[in-house]
């Protein structure tokens, strides 16, 4: 074995050869020691770092059978799928005793066609919208030069001439295909191929054309689409959720949208089975062959109110003397707004109609004039809102009231001297 | 010429905290272990530990775990004994010294000699 | 841990006289860890012979060693007067120790 004085000489026999190649390649680099004693562990240091992880494998050969004989150790290193982060210098490592031995250095390098760091990817594109792609390539050896393509046709005279990692481009009207080419003095290495796929521009000016208590209408500037014709426009609208609240841009609305196609032109859609004096966020987007564009932000609306669709309910008219006690119940039919209260009328057979606002009382008492003697009594009642009236009941005769019969004790209305408006009789 | 040069000797007190230095000249710091070695006084070699300088790693002897420290600056080729909350038996010389295959010591520092005094 | 045994622990030595001093050890261990060391009075220990025979640099070749399995000796063939010190045995076979001097 190698011997120097108390301090020893290197026990490597043999040292880490060189490794040049293409990425991908596999390959193994071999140490060989021979110590006296027991054989050490053999460590790989690659640029002066130990490789904690480092697939290698050690053989161990005694040359003799006193344990302080001598040992041939030898040790692999293998590398498999050379790579950029493999490259350096190797050596290896062994601890004897309290010293430390490195072997010569072998090399590690790569040398082959350029390898993509970055592609280009596929993306969607608003028509004639500017957008960037990437593109990034290395050796060794370098320089790598790149040359993109689109629609298979070079953007440049030559690689390196043109835009490098990355390309803007300032606007499509159809869909097209980009990639890569990098070249190197090991030969040229082409990229994936990416589709840009151009879809129609965001509708804009999204607005009220008319309400209704029920129904929206509502129309938007469609925005462009390149070559290809929009198809259609798909509106969606939502009931507005206060405790949510819908804002501009944000991904989704809380509950399940109504959704609506419209064909184009016209860019217009009426919406309805809405809920009157109701609020609701609407948007819309519009569709080609190659897709459909962005929503528009929400837009928020609201329907207005409407009248009442039916009259109260359950209206009873009793009568007393000159005493008259009606009283009804809210409407079954929707209300379409908010309630602002009931509207009675009543008539005899031979007098004018009286019309009275009750306000949102369900029940009143009529003082009659005179000593009752009026015949035929007739009471309608309707609901109303800010809209209007609701329809008006059919007549109610007034009832004799009946000894037993429950009269609660109301407020009484006296019967103004004057009609306050007069109603058109049915 | 190789050389390993220590610093001054050290009067402290019990409780104190002492850090030895051993600068290493003349070869490759990081290419052999550096061991500490104890001299008490009219007595024989005690043998303390050592500090691999190639990856740092320090190993000590039963006796001295616990409150002794080896350490290393690499870049200035220097190793360093850090001895916490003296104690009267800690006096003595300690030597730093350079080891090699086999377990020998080929190269000793000239030793520090460290009293202890209330 | 290994003990290490010296003896005698003290000896006179006349100019020119053979002297040996031997290193027994409580278990057996291979020659390639016994060292011996010299240190001379006021002085750091030096090494001497390692691995059990092979003398260190600059060591006179009066000086030889020899042993195997727990026994181990140090020899001066001549004594000199320079050669008055204390002789250290030290083993690496496991945990470092020395003789006692």
């Known amino acids: 074995a190698p011997r120097g004085t108390q301090a020893e000489e290197s026990p490597f026999v043999g040292n880490p050869g060189n490794i040049t190649g293409a990425r991908g390649l596999t390959g193994t680099l071999r140490c060989q020691l021979q110590v006296q004693g027991e054989p050490p562990e053999v460590h790989w240091l690659r640029d002066g770092q130990i490789l904690e992880l480092a697939d290698s494998t050690q053989t161990q050969v005694p040359l003799g059978e006193d344990e302080q004989d001598d040992w041939i150790v030898v040790s692999q290193l293998r590398i498999t799928s050379l790579q950029l982060s493999d490259t350096g210098q190797y050596q290896c490592l062994v601890f004897l005793g309290h010293q430390t031995f490195v072997s010569q250095p072998g090399y590690v390098g790569l040398e082959g066609l350029p390898y993509f760091l970055e592609e280009p990817e596929d993306r969607t594109v608003a028509a004639n919208t500017p957008f960037n792609l990437s593109c990034q390539a290395q050796g060794p050896p370098e320089p790598v030069d790149l040359l993109w393509l689109q629609d298979a046709v070079p953007l440049a005279t030559a690689p390196g001439h043109g835009p490098q990692r990355s390309l803007h481009v300032p606007g499509l009207n159809k869909t097209s295909s980009f990639s890569c080419e990098a070249h190197n003095a090991k030969g040229v290495t082409t990229s994936r191929t990416a589709t840009i796929t151009v879809l129609p521009q965001q509708p804009r000016n999204l607005h009220l054309v008319s309400r209704q208590p029920t129904e929206l209408e509502v129309a938007w500037t469609p925005g462009l689409s390149g070559i290809y014709p929009l198809t259609h426009c798909t509106l969606q609208a939502v009931l507005s959720d206060d405790g949510m609240g819908i804002q501009a841009g944000e991904p989704d609305p809380p509950e399940e949208p109504l959704t609506s196609q419209a064909s184009v032109p016209p860019h217009q859609l009426r919406l309805g089975s809405l809920h009157p004096h109701t609020p609701y966020h609407i948007r819309v987007a519009c569709t080609s062959s190659q897709g459909p564009s962005s929503w528009t932000h929400w837009l928020p609306v609201e329907t207005p109110e409407g009248v009442p669709l039916g009259p109260p309910e359950n209206i009873s008219a009793t009568r007393n003397g000159s005493q008259a006690f009606v009283h009804w119940q809210e409407p079954r039919a929707p209300l379409q707004g908010t309630l602002l209260g009931y509207r009675l009328a009543y008539q005899g057979q031979d007098t004018p109609e009286v019309l009275m606002d009750i306000g949102l009382r369900q029940e009143v008492t009529l003082e009659l004039q005179g000593d009752g003697s009026v015949s035929n009594l007739t009471v309608c009642v309707a609901a109303y809102t800010a809209a209007g009236d609701g329809p008006w009941s059919l007549p109610v005769p007034l009832e004799a009231w009946r000894p037993g019969q429950a009269q609660p004790v109301h407020q009484l209305v006296k019967e103004p001297s004057t009609p306050a408006f007069s109603w058109p009789w049915w | 010429q190789i050389q390993l040069v220590q610093s001054g000797p050290e009067l402290k007190k019990p409780g104190e905290t002492v850090k030895i230095s051993c600068k290493a000249s003349g070869y490759t710091f990081t290419n052999y272990g550096m061991n500490w070695v104890k001299q008490a006084p009219g007595k024989g070699l005690k043998w303390m530990g050592w500090i691999n300088t190639y990856i740092g790693e320090p190993t000590y002897a039963d006796d001295f775990k616990g409150r002794f420290a080896f350490s290393l600056e690499t870049s200035a080729s220097t190793a360093y004994l850090q001895i916490n909350n003296l104690k009267n038996e800690d006096m003595g010389t300690y030597f730093c010294?350079?080891?090699?295959?086999?377990?020998?010591?080929?190269?000793w520092g000239q030793g520090t000699s460290v009293t202890v005094s209330s | 841990e290994i003990v290490l045994t010296q003896s005698p622990t003290t000896m006179a030595a006349s100019p020119g006289e053979k002297i040996t001093i031997t290193c027994s050890a409580s278990?057996?261990?291979?020659?390639?860890?016994l060292h011996w060391y010299q240190q001379k009075p006021g002085f750091s220990p030096k090494l001497l012979i390692y691995?059990?025979?092979n003398l260190a640099s600059g060591v006179p070749a009066r000086f030889s060693g020899s042993g195997s399995g727990t026994s181990y000796s140090l020899t001066i063939g001549t004594m000199e007067a320079e050669d008055v010190a204390t002789y250290y045995c030290?083993?690496?076979?496991?945990?470092?120790?020395f003789g006692a001097g």
């Open positions: 010294a350079r080891g090699t295959t086999f377990y020998a010591m080929d190269y």
């Open positions: 691995r059990t025979s």
């Open positions: 278990s057996s261990i291979s020659s390639n860890y």
């Open positions: 030290q083993q690496g076979s496991s945990i470092l120790t």
